[in-house]
């Protein structure tokens, strides 16, 4: 399932960096969230549970990230113009079944005021 | 699995239109291929087989398409500048198992020479 454009504010700028917000439904217990820049994996975070309900959080492509019960935020720092691109949150839902993949995204525009080190 | 940028010529221009080539491995017997523009599903094609090995080809979002034993081509016509975007081939492999999703894509640049109806 492709949700297309995120229907929420996906990019939150602060201090020359950006927080990219990837939401998922509260009901989702186990998943993999990937942040794609164009078609490349930039960051990922996988949450699974074992048979004793113990949670495991893993990252193969590590970025500074923050997990809540309905979102994963990935943080990119030292923004420059090369960061302008399409970004997608690629969510693979493992639990509850059925297995499902959703892709939501938007274009990250970089304006002078958001760059980390503006030339004076 | 995200393969990222297509490592082959994904866009083939002719007569003011474009053929978008979505490749898959020869070994794949049953699959769904979606063409995404940004994060939106533009076209899809699903190939499955019944118990008697009878092949079924289905399309929920229909575009002119062409199926070979290792690719699906989607055709877009009457190109204009609004077609410039990231396009992704989203392949879901059902058979052989395990179930797998791969995303490959690239940016479709539209130049004057490729437009269907250039202003003289």
């Amino acid at each position: 399932e492709i949700n297309g454009s995120a229907n929420y504010e996906m990019f939150i700028f602060h201090n020359g960096g950006v927080q990219i917000l990837c939401k998922y439904p509260d009901i989702v217990q186990q998943f993999k969230m990937q942040l794609l820049k164009g078609g490349q994996i930039l960051c990922d975070l996988t949450k699974t549970k074992g048979s004793g309900n113990k949670v495991s959080i893993k990252s193969l492509k590590f970025c500074h990230s923050q997990l809540s019960n309905n979102s994963v935020s990935f943080f990119l720092y030292n923004l420059d113009r090369s960061h302008a691109n399409y970004y997608f949150c690629n969510l693979s839902i493992f639990d509850p079944p059925p297995f499902k993949v959703t892709l939501t995204g938007g274009y990250l525009h970089i304006y002078e005021s958001q760059l980390c080190c503006q030339l004076k | 699995e995200i393969n990222g940028s297509a490592n082959y010529e994904m866009f083939i221009f002719h007569n003011g239109g474009v053929q978008i080539l979505c490749k898959y491995p020869d070994i794949v017997q049953q699959f769904k291929m979606q063409l995404l523009k940004g994060g939106q599903i533009l076209c899809d094609l699903t190939k499955t087989k019944g118990s008697g090995n009878k092949v079924s080809i289905k399309s929920l979002k229909f575009c002119h398409s062409q199926l070979s034993n290792n690719s699906v081509s989607f055709f877009l016509y009457n190109l204009d500048r609004s077609h410039a975007n990231y396009y992704f081939c989203n392949l879901s492999i059902f058979d052989p198992p395990p179930f797998k999703v791969t995303l490959t894509g690239g940016y479709l640049h539209i130049y004057e020479s490729q437009l269907c109806c250039q202003l003289k």
């Epitope: 009901i27 004793g52 509850p96 | -």
Partner: antibody, heavy 117, light 111 residues
């Protein structure tokens, strides 16, 4: 097709050691938690322990904690159970099982461990 | 640890019978909107097989004569029209917390 094949079972003396292996194929082994479950002859199923996808977390049943160790090799697609200080009550068929996110969705055929002097 | 109990421990059945197996947990297995309760079938000399997960969801390929129900601490596995190939032992299992535990099992035998 998911396949799990246990090996390494046999006769072991009380206080002795034994290492069981489980060779996995047909799925991406490193994506799944894996478990060991045992069954004493004529009895019910008993969970032994589990290990997470990369081997950094392992949990054990109170009956085996401190004596048994679960490990995995994701390059060889193999799960292990190192059994030390075995007791007669450890006699059982040991099954390797894939934890398919919300249930044991695939099981091996089992390997019999007999603890006897 | 959560204790799982099953009743009956054994049951004599005939083809076509409606079979009911009960499972009780010593504390609620409900978390959010899910009951962390699973049913397995084990035929003689074979490994267990997954039948039902989340108390009521049939695993892929499981015939629709198998039905799971219940919530909280009380669960039921129903076989609507028993077939001879359904002979074997049935276990309930929880994965609410560690250690996950199995019920003692229910043996279905031919009458």
């Amino acid at each position: 097709e998911v396949q799990l094949v246990e090996s390494g079972g046999g006769l072991v003396k009380p206080g002795g050691s034994l290492k069981l292996s489980c060779a996995a194929s047909g799925f991406t082994f490193s994506d799944y938690w894996m478990d060991w479950v045992r069954q004493a002859p004529g009895k019910g199923l008993e969970w032994v322990g589990n290990i997470d996808e990369d081997g950094s977390i392992a949990e054990y049943s109170p009956f085996v904690k401190g004596r048994f160790t679960i490990s995995r090799d994701n390059v060889k697609n193999t799960l292990y159970l190192q059994m030390n200080s075995v007791k007669s009550e450890d006699t059982a068929t040991y099954y390797c099982s894939r934890w398919g996110r919300f249930a044991f969705d695939s099981w091996g055929q089992g390997t019999l461990v007999t603890v006897s002097s | 640890d959560i204790v799982m109990t099953q009743s009956p421990s054994s049951l004599a059945v005939s083809a076509g019978d409606r079979v009911t197996i009960n499972c009780k947990s010593s504390q609620s297995l409900l978390s959010g909107s899910f009951n962390y309760l699973t049913w397995y079938q084990q035929k003689t000399g074979q490994a267990p097989k997954l039948l039902i997960f989340y108390a009521s969801t049939r695993h892929t390929g499981v015939p629709d004569r198998f039905m799971g129900s219940g919530s909280g601490t009380d669960f039921t596995l129903t076989i609507n029209s028993f077939q001879t190939e359904d002979l074997g032992d049935y276990y309930c299992h929880h994965h609410y917390n560690a250690p996950p535990t199995f019920g003692p099992g229910t043996k279905l035998e031919l009458r």
